[in-house]
């Protein structure tokens, strides 16, 4: 229940005090260069989240202004910028926009809850699905692999589309699509397991559209601390949706007496949410990029975006670190409940399990811990980072690194504690997961800082692809393979069932340490990459001829 698709969403943070004065000077200079002191009405209310649709550009570090480039025939509107005085002052917005943006963020977060609710409803009734279709463990693995692989492949495609086309339409279509597929999958006859596999693949495609694009809309609707707050709410949706998915799965199944009904809840809610997104989410413009009009889009190809991202060392290292988190969460999520059950068998506090659900109680406890630590981790990480930003410009990657290295210690301690105390093991899981999840929102901040707005959806998608490919796409199977390998060379006993899985899971803390190292590497390049991104954003504020991305 610990997926990280959204970990790389756009997120802005509180800027460092020492740089504020310089930014204000730059902003005022840009405003003068843009030429006007008078103010006229905004050209349209369409660009929610950017001040007046054509002029003030919310960058990573403040706002800049440029001369508006209206379509031919539009009367020139020189200086349609804010005349507001003082740092950070924003232009007047249409009256409804404030409330509208809040509603939009709430709807997008609700959509994210449903994304994860849908995914984990299937996890909640997986045993029933296995029982009904006669699915072997390798078949259950296939269901997960197909979902992750289709998600992985679709994410970069939606990243490309999300940087170039109407995002709320793509979002709504994505939700309608996975809702229809999930609903249909509840009617698949027993003999058509391959149709269930296909449906999971299609759901992965639908959900990829959401996880890739929704955070970038929130990133464009809000700035600075408000954006951080809204993205935190968006992230809380992950553990909340995951937990609700398990609960929905089991409770609806019990109430209806048939697991198929569990798969009909999220699609109904999905259809409603998709409609609300179409109605309530404004057609946001992409940060500053909208102000630059079409000439920017004409000059930046997908290939160029990819090259720029691959050359961006902070982005590359933070993506590798995210992969390490994904590796650990994927493996732990799948194997820890069974590991703890086996620990109890060894301690003679539980019976050897011959028929499912094995470790159902442990799954439930682990699920509850994951939900809470997901929430706590985001809060802790965001709070720690805001405090550390007062001390250093490298706060974001350093807090992530400390979280990762601390997490590795507690993940190691799980295997020490499990031999004698299940409660001790749960405490270690709690602390370890909280530290591991503390980088969810921060990784998003890092991406936001070092990637220019017109590449954010692509960046989110590529990071999502990488974290799955190197992370949870293979880790559960690798752990299972190592465990089986160890068991083959030992005698068949409950003790060795427990020990072999424990030894295999010891790979996780090593990968987490590696992730911590990647965050430390990110810290080395973070300041320079961030400065380069800001410089590009400021270049974009100049006349079109000088724009170079």
């Amino acid at each position: 229940m610990m997926c990280l698709e959204c970990a790389s969403a756009a997120a802005g943070g509180a800027e460092e005090e020492e740089a504020d004065a310089e930014r204000r000077r730059r902003r005022r200079g840009a405003q003068r260069g843009a030429g006007g002191s008078g103010c006229c009405g905004a050209r349209g209310a369409g660009g929610a989240g950017v001040s007046a649709a054509g002029d003030e550009v919310q960058t990573l570090s403040g706002s800049v202004r440029r001369a508006p480039t209206g379509p031919p025939g539009t009367p020139g509107t020189p200086g349609c910028a804010a005349t507001a005085k003082g740092p950070g002052a924003q232009q007047p917005k249409p009256a409804s926009l404030g409330r509208g943006r809040g509603a939009a963020a709430a709807i997008l977060s609700l959509g994210n809850v449903l994304n994860y609710l849908d995914r984990y409803t299937v996890a909640g009734v997986l045993l029933d699905i296995q029982q009904h279709f006669g699915v072997k463990d390798r078949g259950a693995g296939l269901l997960q692999s197909v979902f992750i692989c289709s998600f992985m492949v679709a994410a970069p495609i939606f990243g490309y589309l999300g940087d170039r086309f109407n995002r709320k339409v793509i979002l709504s279509c994505g939700i309608f699509f996975w809702s229809a597929v999930t609903f249909s999958s509840s009617f698949i006859p027993q003999q058509y397991f391959w149709l269930l596999v296909l449906s999971r693949g299609l759901v992965g495609i639908g959900e990829a559209s959401y996880s890739t694009i929704a955070p970038t809309i929130i990133g464009d609707l809000f700035t600075k601390n408000t954006r951080t707050l809204m993205l935190s709410v968006f992230y809380f949706a992950i553990p909340l949706g995951s937990g609700l998915g398990y609960i929905t799965g089991s409770s609806v199944k019990q109430a209806a007496g048939d697991w198929a009904w569990a798969l009909r809840v999220s699609p109904v809610l999905g259809m409603i949410t998709g409609t609300l997104i179409l109605i309530l989410v404004p057609a946001t413009k992409r940060g500053h990029a909208d102000q630059l009009g079409d000439q920017l889009k004409a000059r930046t190809s997908w290939l160029r975006d990819m090259k720029a991202l691959i050359r961006n060392r902070s982005y590359v290292f933070s993506s590798l670190a995210t992969s390490a988190v994904s590796f650990a969460t994927g493996a732990l999520g799948m194997w820890i409940p069974l590991y703890l059950h086996r620990a109890q068998v060894v301690q003679k506090t539980a019976e050897t399990c011959n028929s499912p659900p094995c470790g159902a109680k442990d799954s439930l406890i682990f699920g509850a811990i994951t939900c809470f630590t997901g929430f706590l981790g985001v809060v802790t990480g965001a709070g720690a980072t805001r405090w550390c930003r007062l001390k250093t410009q490298r706060a974001d990657p350093l807090v992530c690194a400390v979280g990762m290295l601390g997490s590795a210690i507690f993940i190691c301690l799980i295997f020490v504690a499990a031999k004698s105390s299940i409660v001790g093991a749960y405490i270690c899981i709690f602390v370890g997961e909280t530290l591991l999840f503390s980088n969810w929102a921060i990784t998003a901040d890092i991406l936001m800082y070092v990637v220019i707005p017109t590449r954010r959806a692509t960046a989110v998608a590529l990071q999502s692809f990488t974290s799955h490919l190197l992370g949870d796409a293979g880790s559960p199977y690798l752990i299972g393979f190592i465990s089986d390998l160890i068991r083959q060379s030992t005698k068949d006993s409950p003790l060795w069932e427990f020990l072999s899985l424990g030894y295999a899971l010891m790979l996780c803390p090593f990968v987490v340490v590696l992730g911590g190292m990647f965050f430390l590497a990110t810290a080395l390049f973070f300041v320079s990459d961030r400065a380069r991104a800001e410089q590009q954003v400021n270049q974009l504020a100049m006349p079109p001829a000088s724009v170079k991305v």
Epitope: Q131, K136, D137, F193
Partner: antibody
Framework: EVQLVETGGGLVRPGSSLKLSCATS????????MSWVRQAPGKGLEWVAL??????????NYAESIKGRFTISRDDSKSRVYLQMNTLRDQDTATYYC????????????????WGQGVMVTVSS | DIVLTQSPPTLSVTPGESVSLSCRAS??????IHWYQQRSNESPRLLIK???QSIAGIPSRFSGSGSGTDFILSINRVESEDFSVYYC?????????FGPGTKLEVK
């Protein structure tokens, strides 16, 4: 050619135990789910127990009427499936069939595509 | 548990006639029904799987239909070797259950 051969039947007293064995050949036993189905004299068919393959953790399922008394097990190295019957009752008198479930690698059918010739178990005092 | 009811319990026909055997489930089971034939003093054999899917080696005169709760096994032009007992089985949920059987006898 798929072959299922049951052995171990006979006449026993109520309360005693008996172990049925089913030797298989002609297919990949380790990947296949196996079941025992019984038929009381002059009556219909009744499913008794199912054992899944190692890829499904050799999970066992039982009919309510025999739960706690009968145990199904398998030995992949010998391609054999067993039914350990304890605390036998008069109503356990039946012909016991060893059956195979059709396998599709990722999943298995719950129906029986091959049946053994059956072995008679008589519980009587 | 899902209960299967077969009707009629006994069916008397003359060779060459076509017959339909019925199986009704106590709840909706989609197409998770299978048909077996058991000749006298022999083991059962699978005739039809998943309500209508044919099995290799089974004569084409055997066919199945139905979905939900009502299922039919049809035998087109009954032959002498077809006189036996026919059972339906559900695999929608555990425990696996069989119908009581329909005996097809010579008129």
């Amino acid at each position: 050619e798929v072959q299922l051969v049951e052995t171990g039947g006979g006449l026993v007293r109520p309360g005693s135990s008996l172990k049925l064995s089913c030797a298989t050949s002609g297919f990949t036993f380790s990947d296949t789910w196996m079941s025992w189905v019984r038929q009381a004299p002059g009556k219909g068919l009744e499913w008794v127990a199912l054992i899944k393959d190692k890829n499904s953790n050799s999970e066992a399922n039982y009919a309510e009427s025999i739960k706690g008394r009968f145990t199904i097990s398998r030995d992949d190295s010998k391609s054999r499936v067993y039914l350990q019957m304890n605390t036998l009752r008069d109503q356990d008198t039946a012909t016991y069939y060893c059956t195979r479930h059709e396998d599709f690698y990722y999943y298995s059918g719950y129906y029986f595509d091959y049946w053994g010739q059956g072995v008679m178990v008589t519980v009587s005092s | 548990d899902i209960v299967l009811t077969q009707s009629p319990p006994t069916l008397s026909v003359t060779p060459g006639e076509s017959v339909s055997l019925s199986c009704r489930a106590s709840q909706g089971i989609s197409t998770s029904i299978h048909w077996y034939q058991q000749r006298s003093n022999e083991s059962p054999r699978l005739l039809i799987k998943y309500a209508s899917q044919s099995i290799a080696g089974i004569p084409s005169r055997f066919s199945g239909s139905g979905s939900g709760t009502d299922f039919i096994l049809s035998i087109n032009r009954v032959e002498s070797e077809d006189f036996s007992v026919y059972y339906c089985q559900q695999t929608y949920s555990l425990p696996l259950t069989f119908g009581p059987g329909t005996k097809l006898e010579v008129k």
